[in-house]
Each structure stands twice: as structure tokens, then as C-alpha cells.
């Protein structure tokens, strides 16, 4: 699985979209985790609603929000008020039983706002523009994207 590199500006929001085969992953909850070291475990940051059909509802842990469109096969993670310490390697996961299948690996890079070091004068950014989709440096082919789950179902809690 290739790694997608996303860049976001410090203080802004970075939105990550992981696409997956909706029918293959039928019934499964999704999660966003942070990789601890290159070979280390992936520490869960946030997972989707415990009830599969309510996965479209946003779930938050601190400044990270997750929501899953289970029909379209897109899980969206928003990292709000991005900080330098948020930089690192993450995974979108599909949960089944006690196992987690990696849907996509994402390297988050945080760029310092150049205006922080200058007199910004009267320059301002409207509230609506403060969500940054991220500069996608390298896009990986994540899993097969046919609209198409082992069936190991995942609704309620996690594995």
C-alpha cells in the first residue's frame, strides 16, 4: 500500500478522505490511527459511530473528527487546528472483529504559516476558508474502488 502525503497549514483544518470498496467492507466500522514509529503499533485516535448505519454522524476525539459514508465508500477525517505535533504517519482502517485492515496510509505534514513571522497588517482570511483540503503531494492507489465486504460484520463497538 502506497502512502499518501498531505500537507496542511498550522492552525487550519486538514481534511483526509480515504476511499474503499463499500460492498467489500459492508458492516465494518472505520478508524483513524497514528503510527508509532516505522514498525510500531498504530494507536487509535478515533473510530466511527458504534452503530454501522449511523457512521455518517461525526465522532470526535479532541481535535480529530471522523465520519463515514458507508454507501459511497468514503471515510473522512478532519484534523482541526493543525499543530506541528500532528505531523506523522497515520492509517485509515477497516475494523473487523479484533483485526484492523489498512485502507490507506497517510503522511501528514504541517507547514508553518509564513504570516506568523511577518506583520500581517490588515490581511485576514474569511472563516469559511479556514478548512484546508491539503496539498496532495503523492496519491496512492488505495484499495479497489468498484462500488462494491468478509464478512465479518462491523456495527457496534470495535474489535
Amino acid at each position: 500500500l502506497n502512502t499518501t502525503v498531505l500537507q496542511g497549514m498550522a492552525g487550519q483544518s486538514l481534511r483526509v478522505s480515504c476511499t474503499y470498496d463499500a460492498l467489500k467492507h459492508w458492516g465494518r466500522r472505520k478508524a483513524w490511527c497514528r503510527q508509532l514509529g516505522e514498525e510500531g503499533p498504530c494507536q487509535r485516535v478515533v473510530s466511527t459511530h458504534g452503530v454501522w448505519l449511523l457512521a455518517f454522524l461525526k465522532k470526535r476525539n479532541g481535535s480529530t473528527v471522523i465520519a463515514d459514508d458507508t454507501l459511497a465508500g468514503t471515510v473522512t477525517i478532519t484534523l482541526k487546528n493543525l499543530q506541528a505535533g500532528d505531523a506523522g504517519l497515520y492509517q485509515c482502517q477497516s475494523l473487523r472483529g479484533r483485526e484492523a485492515e489498512v485502507l490507506q496510509k497517510v503522511l501528514v505534514e504541517v507547514l508553518e504559516d509564513p504570516l506568523d513571522d511577518q506583520d500581517a497588517g490588515d490581511l485576514w482570511v474569511p472563516e469559511e476558508s479556514s478548512s484546508f483540503e491539503g496539498a496532495q503531494v503523492e496519491h496512492s492507489t488505495s484499495r479497489n474502488q468498484e462500488t462494491s465486504f468478509p464478512p465479518t460484520s462491523h456495527h457496534h463497538h470495535h474489535h
Epitope: D21, L23, K24, W26, G27, R28, V51, W52, L53, L54, T70, R96, G97, R98, E99, R143, N144, E146, T147, S148, F149, P150, P151, T152, S153, H154, H155, H156, H157, H159
Partner: antibody, heavy 125, light 107 residues
């Protein structure tokens, strides 16, 4: 009609190779997990593994990992189970089955809702 | 692997009887469990999915219950065609695993 049709009975000698098939029709084969189940004579059902033909994702039971190979050709809606070197203990009935998708309450579930008729494999010297 | 223990392994009953078969998982599997019926020389047939939901076309005398580790299949009033072997299957975790089966025989 939604169905899985398996290849015919096989009689083989120990050490020989074999590949049996399971052809789906009446549904979108590539978007369903397909499982394989063994039933030795007079015994219960044993789950061998599954494949998702859409991207060839395969999961084996540890009991069968390295003993058999599961594969699929999505262009002809067919899943396969193969052995490179048969043993007498492989004598059994083998079933393929589709994992149907269900919604119950607010959860998404699976059940093996469509089964092949079974393929009898006999291994004897 | 998750072990599924079915009991009893065999059961003699009469037409009209109420019969209960149980399945216990070695660890919690939520409600990711199905029940299957198999008659001699035939492929298994799905009766119940999600522990308690009746598969389309299956008579309402069959019902399932349970969650976590303990599950039950009940046949409220046995009919002649119900004499068969019944299996539970967990599909919460890989590898999916069957119970060893319960053979239901005519008394």
C-alpha cells in the same frame, strides 16, 4: 436465478494436484465474498477460507493455510480451490458459498446464503 | 481462533416438541452469528443471521437469540422436515468458525 455451480466429483491418487471450481450466476459475483467449507465423511463443517473476487483479497483458516490455495477469476465469475499434492485425508465434500449482505437493526451483517451443490473429492491409492 | 461449542451434540425429539440448541463462543462475538441446517447429502441452508434475524423463506417456528458469547436456536414446534443437523457459525473474526453440529433425530 442466483446460484453457485460446482465442478464434478473427482477421484485422485495421493500426490496428485487438483483444482475444483465454483461458478456464480444471477448476481454480481465480484462484489460478494465467497467462502469454502470442508466436510469430511460423517463429520461437521469446517471453514477453510474466503475470497473477495473484486480484488482477490483472501483469508485462510490457519488449519488450511499452506494446504490449499483459494483463487478466483472475476472475468468468468468463478472461484477455485486447489491442491498441489493431495493426501488421503483430503477426502471430503467441499462446498463454496456466497456471503450475502444483510441489514438488521442498524448493523451490517453477513450470512452464507447461497451454496454450491458440493464437490466430492476422493483421494485413494 | 474463536472456538464455538454447540450442545447437545445429538438430540432425540418428537414432532410438535419445542427444541433448543445452544452455541457458546470462547470469546465475545457480539451478534455476528448464523445458524445453518443441513440434511443428509445436501448443502447447508442459512436459517438465522445476526443471531436473531430470520432468513427469508425460513418458517417462523425457527428463532434465534443471544449476544456476546451465548446463543440459542429454538424450534417452537418440530415438523418432520426439521430432523437434520444444525450448525452455528461465527463471522465476527477470522477465521470464521463453525460449531461441531447438533444432530436432531426422531424419538
Amino acid at each position: 436465478e442466483v446460484q453457485l455451480v460446482q465442478s464434478g466429483a473427482e477421484v485422485k491418487k495421493p500426490g496428485e494436484s487438483l483444482k475444483i471450481s465454483c461458478k456464480g450466476s444471477g448476481f454480481s459475483f465480484n462484489t460478494y465474498w465467497i467462502g469454502w467449507v470442508r466436510q469430511m465423511p460423517g463429520k461437521g463443517l469446517e471453514w477453510m477460507g474466503i475470497i473477495y473476487p473484486g480484488d482477490q483479497d483472501i483469508r485462510y483458516s490457519p488449519s488450511f493455510q499452506g494446504q490449499v490455495t483459494i483463487s478466483a477469476d472475476k472475468s468468468i465469475s468463478t472461484a477455485y480451490l486447489q491442491w498441489s499434492s493431495l493426501k488421503a485425508s483430503d477426502t471430503a465434500m467441499y462446498y463454496c458459498a456466497r456471503y450475502g449482505r444483510y441489514i438488521y437493526g442498524y448493523g451490517g451483517y453477513h450470512g452464507m446464503d447461497v451454496w454450491g451443490q458440493g464437490t466430492t473429492v476422493t483421494v485413494s491409492s | 481462533d474463536i472456538q464455538m461449542t454447540q450442545s447437545p451434540s445429538s438430540l432425540s425429539a418428537s414432532v410438535g416438541d419445542r427444541v433448543t440448541i445452544t452455541c457458546r463462543a470462547s470469546q465475545a462475538i457480539r451478534d455476528d452469528l448464523g445458524w445453518y441446517q443441513q440434511k443428509p447429502g445436501k448443502a447447508p441452508k442459512l436459517l438465522i443471521y445476526a443471531a436473531s434475524s430470520l432468513q427469508s423463506g425460513v418458517p417462523s417456528r425457527f428463532s434465534g437469540s443471544g449476544s456476546g458469547t451465548d446463543f440459542t436456536l429454538t424450534i417452537s414446534s418440530l415438523q418432520p422436515e426439521d430432523f437434520a443437523t444444525y450448525y452455528c457459525l461465527q463471522n465476527y473474526n477470522y477465521p470464521h468458525t463453525f460449531g461441531q453440529g447438533t444432530k436432531l433425530e426422531i424419538k
